[in-house]
Every structure is written in C-alpha cells, then in structure tokens.
C-alpha cells in the first residue's frame, strides 16, 4: 500500500528509515462522521445468547490509554428459556488492533506501533462433537 | 495518561502543539507475541448462529492499509435445524479502532490519527417486541 508516497517535491526516502520515524498528529478525527457511535447499541452484551462483560484495560503509556475488553460470561450459550444450552458454546470474537506505545525515556517523545489482540464481544457456535474412530 | 512525558531533560510543552506532532515508529511490534493471530479461529464466521462474511477494506493512504470488515449474513439467527429463527436477530458487533491516515500533500509525510468503527463479527440477540400501549 502507498504508505510511503513518492512525489517530485519529496526526496526519496528509505522505507526502513521512514517507518521508524514518522510524524503523527494525535488529535483524534472520526473518519465516519460525528454520529458514528450512535449506531452501536450498548445492550447487546446483555441481550446476546452469548452475553459478555467488559473490562477496562488501562495503560498510561499507551494511546488509547483505555481499551474496553470483552469476556464471555458463560462457556455455553443461553437458550430461549434463559437456560444454558450444553450443545452450544459461547466464544470470544477477537480483533487485532493497533495501539501506540510510548518508548520509555524518549525525549523528544516517540511512540512505536504495537498490535494488540482484544476481545470485542461473543458469539454462539455449535459445539464440535468429536466422533470416535 | 503519560502521552506527554516530562522529565528534567524535556522542556514544558503546550498540549495542543504536542498532540499535533509526535514521532512514531511504524515498525509493528506484537504486544502479545509473534503467534498472536494463531489464537483466532477463523471458522466462527461460518459456525456461529449469527454467521458473517468478511470484506476487504483497502486504503493506500491508511495504516494499516487493509482492514477486514464483518457483515452479518442474515437478519435473523440460524437455529439448530439450520433454519432462520424469526424471534432472534443477527446483529453486528462493532469496535472503534485507531488508524493512521496520511495527511494529503504532506512532505515530509505526516499522519493523523483517525477513529474508525469496524464490524468485527455478529452475535444473536432476542428480538425486542414492541408492546402496544
């Protein structure tokens, strides 16, 4: 992807040097418009057949400094009667996200990009029954 | 959070200037180890009672340039018989992620942080029945 643009106005840049030292504006913009979050109902975590809880993960040297992580409430799914269904498993949907971590003791301050795997919510899947050979 | 470190070696900084110009190393580190992705079974999207498909969202001026976005396959959930259950809705679980967008025409090239709301997977919730007054 054209992350390293080349133009007549910019001298050629070694990719490796470029990647290790880019300037970033940390003032956050919404790429999907101001109303972006209104489309995210917050009650799915309770209403789902595979309900989850959210835990606040804090790291003062990370940007974002707070990330909410999901954990499934049960190993099984909840059926229409509100009982746990032993044929169905509640599983965590995870996503790999990018975060910025401050380099220790850096001055002027620099960050490095890190990948982090976070739980976002849970879904219900049929248990896989292992058949005897 | 300690986004703006102050030490005896670093002079005071106006927050707004700081946030608009930090240095970032874009060489990606895994905060959870090299095998991070291997813990994400990719068959949930087919096995779930609220299955989903993944679509490739590409933007050459974004870091990461490729993001996979989920879309629920059905409006309803799939029951044990493989039929759609009209009492249960398949809903998209979304997460706000951080991406870096290249500032147009910037030279030397700079990025700004953007928030993006992406679909990660789907979950099954009971339909809300609107009661007549």
């Amino acid at each position: 992807a054209a992350i390293i643009p080349q133009s007549s106005a910019c001298p050629n840049t070694e990719a490796k040097d470029f990647l290790q030292n880019v300037k970033v504006n940390l003032k956050v913009f919404n790429s999907l418009g101001a109303k972006v979050s209104s489309r995210r109902p917050s009650d799915y975590l309770n209403r789902s057949t595979s309900p989850w809880t959210l835990h606040r993960n804090e790291d003062p040297d990370r940007y974002p400094s707070v990330i909410w992580e999901a954990q499934c409430r049960h190993q099984r799914c909840v059926n229409a009667e509100g009982k746990l269904d032993h044929h169905m498993n509640s599983v965590l949907i995870q996503q790999e996200i990018l975060v910025l971590k401050r380099e220790p003791e850096s001055c002027p301050f620099t960050f490095r990009v890190e990948k982090m795997l976070v739980g976002v919510g849970c879904t219900c899947v049929a248990s896989i029954v292992r058949q005897a050979a | 959070a300690a986004i703006i470190p102050q030490s005896s070696a670093c002079p005071n900084t106006e927050a707004k200037d700081f946030l608009q110009n930090v240095k970032v190393n874009l060489k990606v580190f895994n905060s959870l180890g090299a095998k991070v992705s291997s813990r994400r079974p990719s068959d949930y999207l087919n096995r779930s009672t609220s299955p989903w498909t993944l679509h490739r969202n590409e933007d050459p001026d974004r870091y990461p340039s490729v993001i996979w976005e989920a879309q629920c396959r059905h409006q309803r959930c799939v029951n044990a018989e493989g039929k759609l259950d009209h009492h249960m809705n398949s809903v998209l679980i979304q997460q706000e992620i951080l991406v870096l967008k290249r500032e147009p025409e910037s030279c030397p090239f700079t990025f700004r942080v953007e928030k993006m709301l992406v679909g990660v997977g789907c979950t099954c919730v009971a339909s809300i029945v609107r009661q007549a007054a």
Partner: antibody, heavy 119, light 107 residues
C-alpha cells in the same frame, strides 16, 4: 459547547435509593466515558466509577461497588448513578465528569448534585 | 490506591502575588496529573493536564510542572477572579484520586 447538566438537590430518607442524572450536550455522548465522583467535607473527593455509554461497560472503585450502579441512556444522552441503602454517610455532593479514553484525561465536569440523607 | 497529598490547605494572598501549590503522589504517576479550579456554584474547570500543559483557553499566568511524584501548580500574578479552590487529580490509573484542595482567598 460541551456541557454536563446534573439533576437538582435531593433529600431522601435512610434506607431508600436515589437516582442522580447527568445530561450531556455539545458532543457525541457515546464517544466518551462518564465518571462519577463523591465530595464530602471530611473525605474530600473520591472516585466512584465509570460507564462507557458507547459499549455499556462499567468499572467501579471497590469501595462503592455495593453502593452505586451506573447506567446510561443513549437516546437522551444521559448518564445515571443509582445509590442504594442510603445512610447519612452518603450525604455528599456528587459530580459527573467526562474522560477522554484516547488522551487519558478528564476535561469537563458537571455542576454537582447535593444529596442529603436524613430522617 | 495512590494518595495525593496537597499543600497548603489555605492561602490568603493579595492581588499581584505569586502563588505556589504542591501535590505529592504516594507513588510515581509519570506526568499524569491535572489541576482544576473550582469556583463556588460552578463546575470545576480543567486548567492544566499532563502536569505542565495549559488547557485550551487558560491564561498563561497558570503553570504546572513536575514528573513522577512531585508536582507544582503556580499562579504567577494572582488576580481577584482567581478566588477559588484548586485541586490536583492523578489520572494515571483507577481508582483516580485527588488532592485535598487549596482554598485561595484574596485579601
């Protein structure tokens, strides 16, 4: 401009419950956490807990876990804190404040709600 | 939890004076300290975040400094409208904790 408008003063009996509100305006309610803080002359300011209206997540100071319940209604951009089994120790001024999860600091506060618990 | 010890509790000063308030954290909080001004009948207002960064629209007579455990808030030339309670808060991690406040009175 950003505003957090809190409900008016409350006088309640011991043993009862009360629900305080914090109505947000001037920004997208779902994008920021709302935190609650208790202020008394003796103990000063104490952090109670947080709710993220966007995802429904809550976290509490252990000291208030059995006392406070935080909720939010996105349709009215309002955060609520319910305090239960009230005693005179719960008499205080309660504030809501907005927290920026990316940058990691609090920027706006409500004007406070005075709660008096008395028979 | 982290204890924030703020001194002094009261300050009686004249307009034009220089005022210094300190906050000491019981453990390192990096630079995750904010300073607020609370006037009677109003909402507390953020003056300084990240220990030393003046918040948008805050007059430059208000400054902050410090890192780790020791933090200082200064009003270089006190004005009559600065009558208020000033307090620090650590936003390093929950439970977020506060200094006891300093009541500034003008002679």
């Amino acid at each position: 401009q950003v505003q957090l408008q809190q409900s008016g003063a409350e006088l309640v009996r011991p043993g009862a419950s009360v629900k305080l509100s914090c109505k947000a305006s001037g920004y997208t309610f779902s994008d920021y956490e709302i935190h609650w803080v208790k202020q008394t002359p003796v103990h000063g300011l104490a952090w109670i807990g947080v709710i993220h209206p966007g995802n429904g997540g809550t976290a509490y100071n252990q000291k208030f876990k059995d006392k406070a319940t935080l909720t939010a209604d996105k349709s009215s951009s309002t955060a609520y804190m319910e305090l239960s089994s009230l005693t005179s120790e719960d008499s205080a001024v309660y504030y809501c404040e907005r927290f920026l999860t990316y940058e990691g600091y609090f920027d706006y506060w409500g004007q406070g709600t005075t709660l008096t618990v008395s028979s | 939890s982290i204890v924030m010890t703020q001194t002094p509790k009261f300050l009686l000063v004249s307009a034009g004076d220089r005022v210094t308030i300190t906050c000491k954290a019981s453990q390192s909080v990096n630079n995750d300290v904010a300073w607020y001004q609370h006037k009677p009948g109003q909402s507390p207002k953020l003056l300084i975040n990240y220990a030393s960064n003046r918040y948008t629209g805050v007059p430059d007579r208000f400054t902050g400094s410090g890192y780790g455990t020791d933090f200082t808030f200064t009003i270089s030339t006190v004005q009559a409208e600065d009558l208020a309670i000033y307090f620090c808060q650590q936003d390093y991690g929950s439970p977020y904790t506060f200094g006891g406040g300093t009541k500034l009175e003008i002679k």
